[in-house]
Every structure is written in structure tokens, then in C-alpha cells.
Amino acid sequence: KLTIESTPFNVAEGKEVLLLVHNLPQHLFGYSWYKGERVDGNRQIIGYVIGTQQATPGPAYSGREIIYPNASLLIQNIIQNDTGFYTLHVIKSDLVNEEATGQFRVYPELPKPSISSNNSKPVEDKDAVAFTCEPETQDATYLWWVNNQSLPVSPRLQLSNGNRTLTLFNVTRNDTASYKCETQNPVSARRSDSVILNVLYGPDAPTISPLNTSYRSGENLNLSCHAASNPPAQYSWFVNGTFQQSTQELFIPNITVNNSGSYTCQAHNSDTGLNRTTVTTITVYAEPPKPFITSNNSNPVEDEDAVALTCEPEIQNTTYLWWVNNQSLPVSPRLQLSNDNRTLTLLSVTRNDVGPYECGIQNELSVDHSDPVILNVLYGPDDPTISPSYTYYRPGVNLSLSCHAASNPPAQYSWLIDGNIQQHTQELFISNITEKNSGLYTCQANNSASGHSRTTVKTITVSAELPKPSISSNNSKPVEDKDAVAFTCEPEAQNTTYLWWVNGQSLPVSPRLQLSNGNRTLTLFNVTRNDARAYVCGIQNSVSANRSDPVTLDVLYGPDTPIISPPDSSYLSGANLNLSCHSASNPSPQYSWRINGIPQQHTQVLFIAKITPNNNGTYACFVSNLATGRNNSIVKSITVSA
């Protein structure tokens, strides 16, 4: 089928286009080109007769067209009016006609665009700015670039007028950027020069530097003021409200005490019309001041509060030093120094943090020390201690109990017997006690500052007869050659003798056995498996005697080196191999086997039926005691002969 291809389809003004003919039939008489979508003699561009090779211009011929023998048409120096359809009329030798239509579009070469703005100096947080891309061009696409990036998504950015206008609402100083617009059509793309948006802002609140406010007499005072502002701010200085000078820096050499006062920097922006001021109070000391310590909390609660101690005054070019208990600061994660060492922070104070604390100011000549100060750390009460520790008394004696709990401020004490309040004293005294005075004796300690209370309860038994004692232990399952065990005979009773028996015999003499606490406590050092015996304690006084039930010590030991039985190491092929492993251990160990290093089974006995020479090798028994955490093993070589 006869077709026409436009090369290119989109043509720039002034360039050329080739209407290329495809599938031209054979045996042609001639052909003719027309402007438009149909054959119209009034719009003929050119005709061509093949026999004579003669081209004849038509009414629509502009002089810019060239026809080729293959029927293709070249149009040069394209103008806007050339846009549209072109029809080729082919006349075959048999005078049968065939037509095909092609088309192309003509676009102008775009000029370099430029940006116009409705506000060259917008004020921050107040003005809007509308950028327009010039010129307005038909069939052009408009794009915008900010700092060579595509437009960010922002509710303050709005495109309108077919993207030709970019509006920035409520401009901020961050909108100060390079803006470019770009125009595009199918034949060209052009980008404008940058336009820098100059946003007027400020002045912000000025910053006076340096920050320190304390100076020594004779020093130079050099204050600098800065406020973010566009255009740059104009600065004025006032001392105690009196205007000094219109400069960004204020310099006063060789200052005296008279230069103490309030120093005000005023920043003014002539374009926005705004003023902002900052005031700093400068103190000039006649001589190096004696330092002193300020605190945010001198009555901290233990384990709750932090305390910040600050060394005053703040002086430039000064080294700050600290001492606690007349020593330099210890290394501790609870002690933190600020960057300038001026503030010492105690995190989560304890009762040991009372001090005293001193700070020092070091200059070229000397170190000036502050007076020492202390912290009143509020703590407690801890669990009260009731003394004496006896729990058994004979009738007729006096009962005198004293209670003490570590506390700041000192605890207030209350006594309760069987839950009934008795008195608000630290000591409880009952004369000439009887069996009726037996019961639960509670001491309650209260800290009024922290609001905390703690209690301790003691059972008091008044009896002529001694009770049957019992044995308490600090370690029910000691490990051999590692642990010690302390047996204590309960209860503690006044005027009582304590005795001990082991397996029904009196105590053997041994450096590993030690009696203490009035023979009430028996300690076995470095226990062995042979200490696994029955222990009995006895109490006696002038009236009665009694013995405890026996307590058997369960000593954990082993595993010892295991033994594999039978001891044979040579076997005949076809025999059964039945190896048993045993190791002394408490508790019983776990057993496992390996043959030639390969794990087998977790049993005490290894059985292999009808062994062959393939069963030759090393047989290892491994034992493990989970309670002692210890392991042991043994290896046996087995030879099987054919």
C-alpha cells in the first residue's frame, strides 16, 4: 500500500522536511503533489511525468520544493504555514490512480526565556512573589527549577497560567534560591538565566558573644553582636540604657568595676523596619573573686534525686576545679562535669555523697578555693535492727529491746506487740516477763522527710524449757573443694550453751571446722564428700537441754575419672561388645560415648552385637555433672581380631 512518511514529523521553522514515499507502484505514468488531504488542482504543488522526466510547478508551488524521481518531496526553509497534510497522486500506466496522504507539524525555534517578578524584595512571612516565564508562546510547555532541582512539593508553591506563573506565598528566608524557567516544544527546549530571590527578613533576636558575664578589673571588654537579617542589620549599643555607638562590636579597654551594668545590643533592619534587642548583665570584679558553690538541691533524696553544684562566678579564661572530701574528684559514672568544669552533677545521690565539696578557680597566679559545703542527703529508714538478738527468754527476767534504723533525718520509732501499738520510743522495756509476754515484737521506723517506713518483726518466746533447736544452713548443696557451709543453731537464747555432734560423735579436731558466735555457728571450709554426714546441734542451760533433728549435708562432687568395664581390650570377631562406664559423682552424672571421635549414645552402657574388625578403634566415655558444672572422660582402645 502506498504510504508517505514525514522525516521529521515535527519540523522547526527554517529547517527542511522530506516527504518520503514507500511502496511506490511499478509502471507509472507520473505523479503529482498537492497541499491538503485531497487532490485539488488549485492546490497542486508540483507534477512530474516520468517519460519526459519533466517537473511542472502548480499553483501552490513556493519555489522551496524539490521532487525526486522516486516521488519523494523535499520542502526547504520551512515556514509556519507549511504545517498540515500533503497528498501524493500517482497515475499508473494503465491510467489507474492511487493516492496517499502524509503530514508534518511546524514549530517555531523557541527563544531563550526570561523571568519577570512582581516583587523584587519580598518581606519574610508577609509577602507573596509571582514569577512569570516570558514570553508567552503557543504550544509551549513551561517548567520551573529551584537550585537546579525540580519544584519541591509545598502548599506555599502554586503554579498557574498553564504553569507559566510560579507563585510563592508567605515567603521565608529559606526561599532565597536560584529560580529558572524552561520552555519546551517538540523541536526545542530553552532555559532562562537564574533569578535569585532576595527575601528580606529579620532582624532575629541578636546574640551577644562571648556569653560570659563576669570579668576582672583591668581586662578588655570586647562584645560582639549578631542578628540574622537581610539586608544585614545595623547595630547600636546601649550601656545602662545610654546610647554608646552604632557598631557591631563594642570594645572597652581596661575595664573597672564602674563598667558593670546592663549592656544592650539593638539590631535594626532598614528594609523591614524591624528592631530587636538583647540585654546581658556584665559584672566586673575588683579583684579575683572568691569562688562559691550554688546548688539546685541541697536536700536530695537518696537514689531518687540528682544534684547540680555550680561554681560561681562565671569568669572567662578560667579553669574550674573540684574537690570532694579534700580529694580530687573520683572517677564515677554518677559524677558528671559540664564542658567547662563549672557544674558538677551528682546523679542519683547516695548517703555517702554528703561531701564536703569545694570548688576552685585557677588563674595564672593562683587557685582560689571556695568554702567547703555539704549536702544533706535524705535517706532511709533502712530495715530496722532489733537488739539484742535473743529470741528465747526465761520467765522473771527483764526484756529490754532497742531498735535502730539508719535514717536522715533520724527515724521516729514505734513498737507493736502482736500488732498492737505500745509506745513511740526507740527502746522497749518490760520488767519481770512471763510466758504471756511471748509474741511478735514489731519495730517500725519512719522518716518524716522522705515519708518512707520500714519494719522488722522478732518472735520472742518466754519459757522455762528450752525449745527443740533446729539447724539453718547458708548453703544446702555445697560443691566439693569449692564451697564453705555455715550451720547455725536456732534459736538464739540467753545464757545458753551450744553443742555440736557429727554422726553421733563430738566434733573432730580439724582446721576445716570452726566454731563461732558463742559456738552457735559451725563453719565447714572447703567441703569434701566425706563431710556428707548427719549434723546435730544441742542447747542447754541450768534448767533444760535439747537436741535438734539431724541435718545431712548433701555435698555435690565429681564426676571422678570414669572406669570402663570389663577391662578387656581384645575381642574375637562375632562376639558381643558390652561396655559399662561408671564415675563417682553426686548427683549421678550424664554419660555419653564416642567411637573414634564420633558421638554415639547417651547411656551408661554401650552394646554392639557381633563385632567385626571394623569395630576396631578408640572408645571414649564422657561424664558430666550439671550441678557441679564439671566434666571428665576416659578413652579405651578396642581391637577385634578375625
Epitope: 558553690i293 550554688t294 546548688s295 538541691n297 541541697s298 568554702d371 559545703v373
Partner: nanobody, 124 residues
Framework: EVQLVESGGGVVQPGGSLRLSCAAS????????MGWFRQAPGAEREFVAA????????YYADSVKGRFTISRDNAKNTVYLQMNSLRPEDTALYYC?????????????????WGQGTLVTVSS
């Protein structure tokens, strides 16, 4: 028993002066850092001035610096607050506070013992 008793409060015109006294008893005065605090109606108690236990250092809130002076007389167990150039915003209940060998506490947590307060009213 420790007691701190403030006196010297009253009504004064703006620009006028007052001298507050705080008499301490039941404590070894020379070992106590003494402070003055004030509390205006509906406001929190705020630091005004303090003098360390040795008397060698004083410290003032920015709002009173240059107008108020704190001093102590260890022989009389008394601490003073001289208030000049008084302003209406100085109107408050003024409290005396003590801390044993304490640093100069800048918050109420810096003091152990407190007086009952004396009222200062600055009004025309």
C-alpha cells in the same frame, strides 16, 4: 528546736526602701548558709538572695541585682536583706531559709529550715 523569725516587712511606695531581718535560734548560726526567698500571690516561691555560711560570698537573682543587699551578723545570729529602689513587682511574702554548711541553694530544695515569712507590699 530551730526557729527562723522574719521581721521588717510592711507597705512602702515605689522607689522606697525596707530592711528585712531574720533572727535564728536553736542552731550554730555561723555554720549555716542563709537565703531569702519570696512568693507573690498565685506564684511559686522564688530565690532572691543568699549568703554562704562563712559570709565570704553572696548571690542575687537577676531581678534584684544592684537593688538588694544581703548581709549577716554572726554575733547576733541574724541575716539581713536591704531592699532599695523597690518596685510593685517586688510585692510578696519574704521567707528566710537556712542550710547547714550548705551551698547557696537556688531552689527551695536547697534549704532545710524555713521561717514563717514577712509581707512586703510596694504600692503607691
Amino acid at each position: 528546736e530551730v526557729q527562723l523569725v522574719e521581721s521588717g516587712g510592711g507597705v512602702v511606695q515605689p522607689g522606697g526602701s525596707l530592711r528585712l531581718s531574720c533572727a535564728a535560734s536553736g542552731l550554730t548560726f555561723s555554720t549555716y548558709t542563709m537565703g531569702w526567698f519570696r512568693q507573690a500571690p498565685g506564684a511559686e516561691r522564688e530565690f532572691v538572695a543568699a549568703i554562704i555560711w562563712s559570709g565570704s560570698n553572696t548571690y542575687y537573682a537577676d531581678s534584684v541585682k544592684g537593688r538588694f543587699t544581703i548581709s549577716r551578723d554572726n554575733a547576733k545570729n541574724t541575716v539581713y536583706l536591704q531592699m532599695n529602689s523597690l518596685r510593685p513587682e517586688d510585692t510578696a511574702l519574704y521567707y528566710c531559709a537556712a542550710q547547714h554548711f550548705g551551698p547557696i541553694g537556688l531552689t527551695t530544695r536547697g534549704y532545710h529550715y524555713w521561717g514563717q515569712g514577712t509581707l512586703v507590699t510596694v504600692s503607691s
